[in-house]
């Protein structure tokens, strides 16, 4: 797999010396979570008569939250570790000036991987030990000397699982946008057999190759709005745990039987993929169980058939496609592969031929969407917890996440000079980058209005001189009179307002008599009640869409389809003078107040809806007894 003269395996290649573009200046003390490899990096490659500029971003979602590695220790015992501080050197990105381009590379020891421009797939790998600036070979997949590989999944095994194959099903989506649905996640467990381990020579080499492969697979699936996240890697560095046969169907059966036995003590995952160094019989390089994703049979076997890891990545993407319900393209009448190059094939072609595919056909996408409608696909919906992802959150997504000081979007979008868009850290000398109380990269002085009062139940908020964010929105004390009612958590709930909210502008509160009884399931009037805090009763307006109603005389109540539950009068609604609905009963306003809260605010604030002092501009919480400037001076801290 890694011979001493890699170029001996290429028919034609071009020698390039990649040039790394200088990144934006960053603060000298980079946070430790940024690791040794930068968050983003760009390279210029002169190849095929063009200067290609590759913009790459570290794939921070490559490894799942509880990522584990399992191997055999020197004493023969099986060891499972959760590696700490998992910095890595696997990147994804695009080529500048080519809208539909893609790139997936590792930068660990020189550049290795692929970049796609239009219909051309370029592979790159180092020719010597010169690192990222040294000599590299850039070549097209068809110039890699290898035999064509086929998938062992037969038409017979597909037929009953996939249903009729007609051209009419496959309507191409307009443009090349992602499918309009939730991003799905495949939590992947990879097993590497002993033959592959022997071929690569060390755990480190295996780990590097597997991460490279999964990075490529993830990039291929992103076009389908999928992410492939590695949650576990098992390396059989001592001996195989089951017989890996040259017959791929036998090996798959053995893998799935072994996996079923291991499931209780191994990582929970959606899919298992074996990478083997065993040469499968004939031209077969992969075999999978069709439509098995999320089941106990969710898995496939892949022969590492090519010197370049992109080869086994394409095989894995293909076999995982079968797990996701996809058929071979050539089995589907009217199937369109939008590859434009000569003999271009898509990922689900039965044979990969001499060039690696880089996209899914229209029919693969249709099969996938169909599979996702099945209840079994639910395991793909759970998004990884970003706060736990090894490698951390995503810089450039407009969310300030763990370890980030700011996030102004991708570099192409960011116009915020206070934030370094490449690292999501504050620019040199900046105190802040976002927030209503941040101006010109500095925190605004205490007392500046940052959120005006929006109605009679609201309170205005002021900057505190220390934080770039406006303080949390606070409201008038519950029970403060407002138009026709009493303030409650910032709202002014009245029966009339509630009826309008559901029934539209013509909605009104029903007659008082409508509120004098409760309703039992099945729209039956029941026992008398003495207040207006039961079921919300309205008249007039338009019946809300998708809601069932219960009509008794002129009283209209909203109910569930089965008539067992009713829309209640909300908490805080006025039910009489100085009275509000509270816990289903009409009670005195004093239920809101445990004490005279405002007396604690030293005449420099009022009580809010949380029974806390809300200070006037420039005064410090909690009791508005001191000026903010005095408090800051005493603590001696900068914002």
């Amino acid at each position: 797999i890694a011979p001493s003269r890699p170029w001996a395996l290429m028919e034609q290649y071009e020698v390039v010396l990649p040039w790394r573009l200088p990144g934006p200046r960053v603060r000298r003390a980079l946070p430790s979570h940024l690791g040794l490899h930068p968050e983003r990096v760009s390279y210029v490659l002169g190849a095929t008569g063009h200067n290609f500029t590759l913009h790459l971003r570290k794939n921070r979602d490559l490894l799942g939250s509880g990522y584990t590695e399992t191997y055999t220790a020197a004493n023969g015992s099986e060891v499972t570790e959760q590696p700490r501080g998992q910095d890595h050197c696997f990147y994804q990105g695009h080529v500048e000036g080519y809208p539909d381009s893609a790139a997936s590379l590792s930068t660990c020891a020189g550049l290795r991987g692929f970049f796609q421009v239009g219909s051309d797939l370029h592979l790159i790998e180092p020719l010597d030990e010169g690192g990222e600036g040294g000599r590299h070979a850039v070549y097209q997949a068809e110039h890699l000397l290898q035999t064509a590989g086929t998938c062992g999944v037969s038409d017979d095994s597909l037929g009953s699982l996939l249903g009729p194959r007609t051209a009419a099903v496959f309507r191409p989506r307009p443009g090349d946008s992602l499918p309009s649905r939730e991003t799905r996640y495949v939590e992947l467990y990879v097993v590497v057999d002993n033959a592959e381990f022997q071929m690569l020579g060390s755990e480190a080499a295996v780990r590097h190759r597997v991460l490279e492969v999964v990075n490529h697979v993830d990039k291929l699936y992103q076009k389908l709005n999928f992410r492939v996240v590695l949650v576990g890697l098992e390396i059989w560095n001592s001996q195989d745990r089951f017989h890996v046969s040259p017959d791929p169907s036998v090996t798959l059966e053995n893998l799935l039987t072994w996996q079923a036995r291991q499931r209780t003590r191994r990582h929970l995952h959606d899919n298992v993929q074996l990478i083997t160094g065993v040469d499968f019989t004939g031209t077969t390089v992969g075999f999978a169980r069709v439509s098995a994703m999320c089941s106990h049979s969710s898995g496939a076997v892949n022969q590492d058939h090519s010197k370049n890891p992109v080869g086994v990545a394409c095989t894995m993407a293909h076999e995982m496609g079968h797990n996701l319900g996809m058929d071979h393209d050539e089995n589907v009448q009217g199937c369109r592969c939008q590859e434009r190059f000569e003999a271009g094939r898509c990922i689900m072609a039965g044979s990969i031929g001499s060039s690696f595919p880089r996209m899914f056909s229209d029919c693969s996408q249709a099969y996938l969407e169909s599979f996702l409608e099945r209840p079994q696909s639910v395991c793909l919906a759970n998004a990884p917890d970003l706060s736990h992802l090894v490698g951390g959150p995503v810089c450039g997504n407009l969310f300030v996440e763990r370890g980030e000081q700011c996030d102004c979007g991708p570099p192409e979008d960011c116009r915020n000079r206070c934030c370094n868009s490449t690292t999501c850290q504050l620019a040199e000398g900046a105190q802040c980058a976002h927030g209503t109380c941040c101006q010109e990269c500095k925190v605004k002085p205490a007392g500046e209005l940052c959120r005006p009062k929006k109605d009679m139940c609201d309170l205005e908020e002021f900057c505190d001189g220390r934080h770039p964010e406006c303080p949390e929105d606070a409201f008038q004390e519950n029970g403060t009179p407002c138009s026709g009612g009493y303030c409650y958590n910032g709202a002014c709930p009245t029966l009339a307002q509630q009826c309008q909210a559901f029934w539209g502008p013509g909605g009104q509160a029903a007659e008082e008599s409508c509120f004098s009884y409760d309703i039992l399931p099945g729209c039956k009037a029941s026992r008398y009640r003495a207040d207006m805090c039961g079921v919300l009763q309205c008249k007039g307006g338009q019946q809300p869409l998708g809601r069932a109603i219960c009509i008794v005389d002129v009283c209209h109540a909203l109910t569930t389809e089965d008539g067992t539950a009713y829309e209640p009068v909300p908490e805080g609604t006025r039910c009489g003078p100085e009275k509000v609905c509270w816990k289903g009963r009409c009670q005195d306003l004093h239920v809101y107040r445990s004490s005279n809260c405002s007396a604690q605010c030293h005449n420099h604030g009022v009580c809010n809806h949380k029974q806390e002092c809300h200070c006037h501009a420039g005064w410090a919480p909690p009791h508005c007894a001191k000026l903010l400037t005095e408090v800051h001076a005493a603590s001696g801290s900068l914002p």
Epitope: R57, Q222, A383, L398, V400, P410, D413, H434
Partner: nanobody, 124 residues
Framework: EVQLVESGGGLVQAGGSLRLSCAAS????????MGWFRQAPGKEREFVAA?????LYADSVEGRFTISRDNDQNTVYLQMSSLKPEDTAAYFC????????????????????WGQGTQVTVSS
């Protein structure tokens, strides 16, 4: 599947204000970058603003429009002030998963879900 429903459009005089709302349902709202786009008759769809925790604006609306969101209410807002006749357009709300950042949030192709739109007409 995320459903987006815009409201709040209407006819307003130049210099006036309007507040658009976009109610989202179906998925965890806080996992989405929310965007506003607009399209005037016979013109290309144009980026207006986007928001995660932080915000982006088109140069043409910076200082006049404010995007905000309420994760508890699953709603994103576009407060439009100092409106001009050239702001007349159909306004669309869009959502994009936060887990795969695009190259830019300023193009429609970056977003996974779209609302049906609400019309804003600014008269002179």
């Amino acid at each position: 599947e995320v459903q987006l429903v815009e409201s709040g459009g209407g006819l307003v005089q130049a210099g006036g204000s309007l507040r658009l709302s976009c109610a989202a349902s179906g998925r965890t709202f806080s996992n989405y970058v929310m965007g506003w786009f607009r399209q005037a008759p016979g013109k290309e769809r144009e980026f207006v603003a986007a928001m995660g925790d932080t915000t982006l604006y088109a140069d043409s609306v910076e200082g006049r429009f404010t995007i905000s969101r309420d994760n508890d209410q699953n709603t994103v807002y576009l407060q439009m002030s100092s409106l001009k006749p050239e702001d007349t357009a159909a306004y669309f709300c869009a959502a994009r998963s936060r887990f795969i950042p695009p190259l830019t949030f300023r193009t429609g192709g970056a977003y996974d879900y779209w609302g049906q739109g609400t019309q804003v007409t600014v008269s002179s």
